[in-house]
């Protein structure tokens, strides 16, 4: 839904109006699409074109958004590291997992460090 820009708009030089008050974006037909936002200032009125999005998916971008912890230490055995994400926001109809685990390969540097640590532990 279009964000309400109800902040006042200052009138131009020589204008009687000090501030314009803008109403919400009202679609011309149905509940979304192109419409108009009406502004008033004293006896004056203005209409500007605006748009209310029709597609929830476009509005939200990704269906599921997560807040992630920092990456864990490199596991020398698997050569991967893990981090957990907790659901932050889901598109209304998206059936998102509450928590997810993401793995990625360790960088060569991290792998070497993890192997070295493992080696030391064996001695």
């Amino acid at each position: 839904v279009a964000k309400k820009k109800d902040k006042v708009k200052k009138g131009g030089p020589g204008s009687e109006c000090a501030e314009w008050a803008w109403g919400p974006c009202t679609p011309s037909s149905k509940d979304c699409g192109v419409g108009f936002r009406e502004g008033t200032c004293g006896a004056q009125t203005q209409r500007i074109r605006c748009r209310v999005p029709c597609n929830w998916k476009k509005e939200f971008g990704a269906d599921c958004k997560y807040k992630f912890e920092n990456w864990g230490a490199c596991d020398g055995g698997t050569g991967t590291k893990v981090r957990q994400g907790t659901l932050k926001k889901a598109r209304y109809n998206a059936q998102c997992q509450e928590t997810i685990r993401v793995t990625k390969p360790c960088t060569p540097k991290t792998k070497a460090k993890a192997k070295a640590k493992k080696g030391k532990g064996k001695d």
Epitope: V1, D31, C32, C54, W56, T86, L87, K88, K89, A90, Y92, N93, A94, Q95, C96, Q97, E98
Partner: antibody
Framework: QVQLVQSGGGLVQPGGSLRLSCAAS????????MNWVRQAPGQGLEWIGM????????ILNQKFKDKATLTVDISKNTAYLQMNSLRAEDTAVYYC??????????WGQGTLVTVSS | EIVLTQSPATLSLSPGERATLSCRAS??????LHWYQQKPGQAPRLLIK???QSISGIPARFSGSGPGTDFTLTISSVEPEDFAVYYC?????????FGGGTKLEIK
């Protein structure tokens, strides 16, 4: 499990305002859409709008654009419905409900708002 | 706005009978249709989500079908505690809308 406890209903004069509260406990309040629905006496259910606590994104039924304002206070795990310019036809039980497409929803117990002089 | 039409308005059955409640959408809403049960003085309770998905804690006698424009809630064998009002709701587009309800009453 999410528990929603509602408060703030009561008798209001026509033209008056009222702020309803919906306090959440249990699982993460900030991850799920909070809906507000009302039900006039002996009538069906009517959706007012919804808000997402994580960023306060609000989707409002256009019918209520000049009547209702939805807000949240994440520090208090509470959602609010502010109703203005109340009229006799706004007399209803107002419900909040927390929605997850994966697990379903949880509803508050409802709070009765009576608009009368 | 998507209009949901429920039928019948009232359904009179005896315990043990099969209940079939209908909800028709004014346009295709995919599977974005949910069923609620409401008893007097109580908040609605979600029975089925997304046309046919079951909800934890809801008895297996409740089932739903869809998608598209015609949806059905079936109670395979009505129990005494099932007598209530049933609402369908769509979440395909806003405003979210509810059907007018079907009252399931004891015959």
């Amino acid at each position: 499990q999410v528990q929603l406890v509602q408060s703030g209903g009561g008798l209001v004069q026509p033209g008056g305002s009222l702020r309803l509260s919906c306090a959440a406990s249990g699982q993460s309040f900030s991850s799920y859409w909070m809906n507000w629905v009302r039900q006039a006496p002996g009538q069906g259910l009517e959706w007012i709008g919804m808000i997402h606590p994580s960023d306060s994104e609000t989707i409002l039924n256009q019918k209520f654009k000049d009547k209702a304002t939805l807000t949240v206070d994440i520090s208090k795990n509470t959602a609010y419905l502010q109703m203005n310019s109340l009229r006799a036809e706004d007399t209803a039980v107002y419900y909040c409900s927390s929605w997850s497409a994966k697990r379903g929803d949880f509803w508050g117990q409802g709070t009765l708002v009576t608009v009368s002089s | 706005e998507i209009v949901l039409t429920q039928s019948p308005a009232t359904l009179s059955l005896s315990p043990g009978e099969r209940a079939t409640l209908s909800c028709r959408a004014s346009e295709s809403i995919s599977n974005n249709l949910h069923w609620y049960q409401q008893k007097p003085g109580q908040a609605p309770r979600l029975l089925i989500k997304y046309a046919s998905q079951s909800i934890s804690g809801i008895p297996a006698r409740f089932s739903g079908s869809g998608p598209g424009t015609d949806f059905t809630l079936t109670i395979s064998s009505v129990e005494p505690e099932d007598f209530a009002v049933y609402y369908c709701q769509q979440s395909n587009s806003w405003p979210l809308t509810f059907g007018g309800g079907t009252k399931l009453e004891i015959k």
